[in-house]
């Protein structure tokens, strides 16, 4: 019962985590304009992995996609890659873990196979969570570096007369969503790995003892039935199919009354 609960909880926690990773990846607020110690502007800038947006006091929000691959910073590309790898691994992990759930019966699948699949999905969740945490952390580090660089050059004067204020960016909501989601996916993965151990009890190996009686010979092996650890050659191979294709159409409402600064 505890194993089923641990496995089920691990699955739910990972599911929430992966949903969070997807949400964070799609969010536009990875970095937001720093308002502290800056002139109050009637325009608010924020940026995501895929596009940058400007919200005016008028309520109008304008978003522009990054329509170049080669022109983007390598770090941004790396963050994108980490988040996508995290999502793909998490999605495959979810599919594997659905079949591995103890409460779901699929044909005559043995506990050993379920244990194997539980461990596989657990490892996938752990790697997925780590990818998300790494991606968000790399982006955060990039922001911190740029923040202090732009603070050092906050005002670039033209003959001391005209001032150009550089827009500084700070942590956006997506970073916190990403960290929490990555953490949840990681925790879910660990729970799945713990559940795997419970699904596959240790195999009891006793030496076979032969009792010789007069007239006929009987070989007696104690144990009645054999519990497999799930790592033997008897594990059945299941092919997992992942639809994997996901498209998202972004519709910009203009101007939205919810967009006021």
């Amino acid at each position: 019962m505890a194993v089923t609960a641990c496995q089920g909880l691990g699955f739910v926690v990972s599911l929430i985590g992966i949903a969070g990773i997807i949400a964070a990846t799609c969010m536009d607020q990875w970095s937001t304009q720093d308002l502290y110690n800056n002139p109050v502007t009637a325009v608010f800038n924020y940026q995501g992995l895929w596009r940058s947006c400007v919200r005016e006091s008028s309520g109008f929000t304008e978003c522009r996609g990054y329509f170049t691959l080669l022109g983007l910073p390598a770090m941004l590309q790396a963050v994108r890659a980490l988040m996508i790898v995290g999502i793909v691994l998490g999605a495959i992990g979810l599919l594997v873990s659905i079949f591995a759930l103890k409460c779901i019966r699929i044909g005559s699948m043995e506990d050993s196979a379920k244990a194997n699949m539980t461990l596989t999905s657990g490892i996938m969740f752990i790697v997925s969570g780590l990818c998300a945490i790494a991606g968000v952390s790399v982006f955060a580090n990039m922001l911190v570096t740029n923040f202090w660089m732009s603070t050092a050059n906050m005002y670039t004067g033209m003959g001391g007369m005209v001032q150009t204020v550089q827009t500084r960016y700070t942590f956006g909501a997506a970073l916190f969503v990403g960290w929490v989601a990555g953490g949840l996916t990681l925790i879910g993965g660990v729970m799945m790995c713990i559940a795997c151990r419970g699904l596959a009890p240790e195999e009891t190996n006793y030496k076979a003892v032969s009792y010789h009686a007069s007239g006929h010979s009987v070989a007696y092996k104690p144990g009645g039935f054999k519990a497999s650890t799930g790592f033997g050659s008897n594990t059945k191979n299941k092919k997992i199919y992942d639809g994997g294709a996901r498209t998202e159409d972004e519709v910009q409402s203009y101007p939205s009354k919810h967009d006021y600064v």
Epitope: V43, S58, G59, F60, E62, R64, T167, K257
Partner: antibody, heavy 118, light 113 residues
């Protein structure tokens, strides 16, 4: 057609109060901010501040904090400017203007002349 | 506050001639997020409210004749009337829409020579 119609001219004594109205029509009132702009006789334009009809949030220019209050009645799509403790230097034409995307004032009221004289 | 300096204060131009008004901001009005300059130009005739001509420094408002054009970026901006007409006699104001408080230039009076 977007229209902002302001109340008529006012003649007030120093120390009195005045409330100027700005009725909007031709668009969804709560979707766009209403700005107030002052123009003293023979002078230029001075931005006083604005009110967000969706949230009711107000932003005032430093010079207009205190005696100047922006308010709304969304049920009749009307914005108000109230000036208390009137002074002679408050004599001006007061305009309301809609804040449209690009942070531009695309539609203006016809203006309300407030004269403060003893 | 951002100071908007307009020049000249007044301008007399012959009908059909080009009129050029300059506006200088004490800080850049270019927003890095969308590469737009938050500057608008307004025309005000006596006894009338101001009328929007140009926004985002160079985008003409619908219904505005194409003889009016705006240019410039950062801190220096220009309003050009390519061929002055009698109905263009007015005071022209530039206004920055990037920083609070929003501020207007002092105005340029355009007259016919």
């Amino acid at each position: 057609e977007v229209q902002l119609v302001q109340s008529g001219s006012e003649l007030k004594k120093p120390g009195a109060s005045v409330k100027v109205s700005c009725k909007a029509s031709g668009y969804t009132f709560t979707n766009y901010g209403i700005n107030w702009v002052r123009q003293a006789p023979g002078q230029g334009l001075e931005w006083m501040g604005w009110i967000n009809p969706y949230t009711g949030e107000t932003t005032y220019a430093e010079e207009f904090k205190g005696r100047f209050v922006f308010s709304l009645d969304t049920s009749v799509s009307t914005a108000y400017l109230q000036i208390s403790s009137l002074k002679a230097e408050d004599t001006a034409v007061y305009f309301c203007a809609r804040l449209y995307y690009g942070n531009r004032f695309d539609s203006w009221g016809q203006g309300t002349l407030v004269t403060v004289s003893s | 506050d951002i100071v908007m300096t307009q020049s000249p204060d007044s301008l007399a131009v012959s009908l059909g001639e080009r009129a050029t008004i300059n506006c200088k901001s004490s800080q850049s009005l270019l927003n890095s997020g969308n590469q737009r300059n938050y500057l608008a130009w307004y025309q005000q005739k006596p006894g009338q409210p101001p009328k929007l001509l140009i926004y985002w420094a160079s985008t003409r408002e619908s219904g505005v004749p194409d003889r009016f054009s705006g240019s410039g970026s950062g801190t220096d901006f220009t309003l050009t009337i390519s061929s002055l007409q009698a109905e263009d006699v007015a005071v022209y104001y530039c206004q920055q829409a990037y920083y609070y408080p929003l501020t207007f230039g002092g105005g340029t009076k355009v007259e016919i020579k």
